[in-house]
Interface confidence: medium
């Protein structure tokens, strides 16, 4: 059960025990549904910089390195929490905000409604 | 520039303009790198419930519906911010925490180190 307004310490504790600094960093290029990463910056938000994935193709890359047009590259999206300065430009007052971000792309078999 | 401790309104504002309630919801099953979603619950954290993706196969699903072991299903991971009660069980005092979550899976060409 959560109160409406709370005190938050912004001194971030990083619980990532994954010591591999690359993590998913090069998957965007090696994936069969490759994506580009776009920087989204907003000084009124914390974190102020968020990276958004945009799928490169409508189709997916096949074994020959060509686009397979019978498949679809689709974004994997996630709702994340950010802090929004409220009122605007406020130095130490924020509101929790839920935003939808595209984290990467995956290749799916499309649902196709064939003509009878 | 952010101060160390701030006031945060937990009355979440949802900025998701995407009106499609399905979003990525069935991609986990239709992807060539399908995944299962596991519930991770922690009452000391806000949000207390986070869903973690786990890839179903080491390989990827091919056009025949079989696993192709020449490819790899890999998790797409993202660092997200959560609030952790600090001190523990505190009703209105939190600390920002960064955690790594797997959002979904994508199919990649593996990096293969051939023997000379």
């Amino acid at each position: 059960n959560f109160p409406r307004t709370v005190m938050v310490n912004l001194n971030i504790h990083n619980r990532n025990t994954n010591t591999n600094p690359k993590r998913s960093s090069d998957y965007y290029d090696r994936s069969t549904s490759p994506w580009n990463l776009h920087r989204n910056e907003d000084p009124e938000r914390y974190p102020s910089v968020i990276w958004e994935a945009k799928c490169r193709h409508l189709g997916c890359i096949n074994a020959d390195g060509n686009v397979d047009y019978h498949m679809n590259s689709v974004p994997i999206q996630q709702e994340i929490l950010v802090l929004r300065r409220e009122p605007p430009h406020s130095p130490n007052s924020f509101r929790l905000e839920k935003i939808l971000v595209s984290v990467g792309c995956t290749c799916v078999t499309p649902i196709v409604h064939h003509v009878a | 520039n952010f101060p160390r401790t701030v006031m945060v309104n937990l009355n979440i504002h949802n900025r998701n303009t995407n009106t499609n309630p399905k979003r990525s919801s069935d991609y986990y099953d239709r992807s060539t790198s399908p995944w299962n979603l596991h519930r991770n619950e922690d009452p000391e954290r806000y949000p207390s419930v986070i869903w973690e993706a786990k890839c179903r196969h080491l390989g990827c699903i091919n056009a025949d519906g079989n696993v192709d072991y020449h490819m790899n299903s890999v998790p797409i991971q993202q660092e997200i911010l959560v609030l952790r009660r600090e001190p523990p069980h505190s009703p209105n005092s939190f600390r920002l925490e960064k955690i790594l979550v797997s959002v979904g899976c994508t199919c990649v060409t593996p990096i293969v180190h051939h023997v000379a």
Partner: nanobody, 134 residues
Framework: QVQLVESGGDLVQPGGSLRLSCAAS????????IGWFRQAPGKEREGVAC???????????YYVDSVKGRFTISRDNAKNTVYLQMNSLKLEDTAVYYC????????????????????????WGNGTLVTVSS
């Protein structure tokens, strides 16, 4: 030479109608998802409508909420042309309208993303100006 050419843009009063055409040359539109996008002065380009390929899908149409019920996208395979019929035009519909083509089939779930992000489209036209003014 492969190209898309838009036409039909004009000055029209609020409430009026226009039909835009997008003619393809050098390739057949049957295999392509076709989208209409627009860019208003000082704004980012946004998707308006798209229609799926007909060679491996059903050629169904998808629209953004702001134009649903007012705009209709259609294709004439014999003429290798896609149309955007725009009715009940509003001042905020003023923009340069572009058509774009990307080969493939489209998942209904992907249509909205296609219109928002436009992927890396295979072909773009140069645009036609639609001005809605009283």
């Amino acid at each position: 030479q492969v190209q898309l050419v838009e036409s039909g843009g004009d000055l029209v009063q609020p409430g009026g109608s226009l039909r835009l055409s997008c003619a393809a040359s050098g390739f057949t539109l049957d295999d392509y998802v076709i989208g209409w996008f627009r860019q208003a002065p000082g704004k980012e380009r946004e998707g308006v409508a798209c229609i799926s390929s007909i060679s491996n899908s059903d050629g169904r149409a998808y629209y953004v909420d702001s134009v649903k019920g007012r705009f209709t996208i259609s294709r004439d395979n014999a003429k290798n042309t896609v149309y955007l019929q725009m009715n009940s035009l509003k001042l905020e519909d003023t923009a340069v309208y572009y058509c774009a083509a990307e080969r493939g089939r489209i998942d209904p779930d992907v249509a909205g993303y296609f219109l928002r992000e436009s992927y890396v489209m295979d072909y773009w036209g140069n645009g036609t100006l639609v001005t809605v003014s009283s």
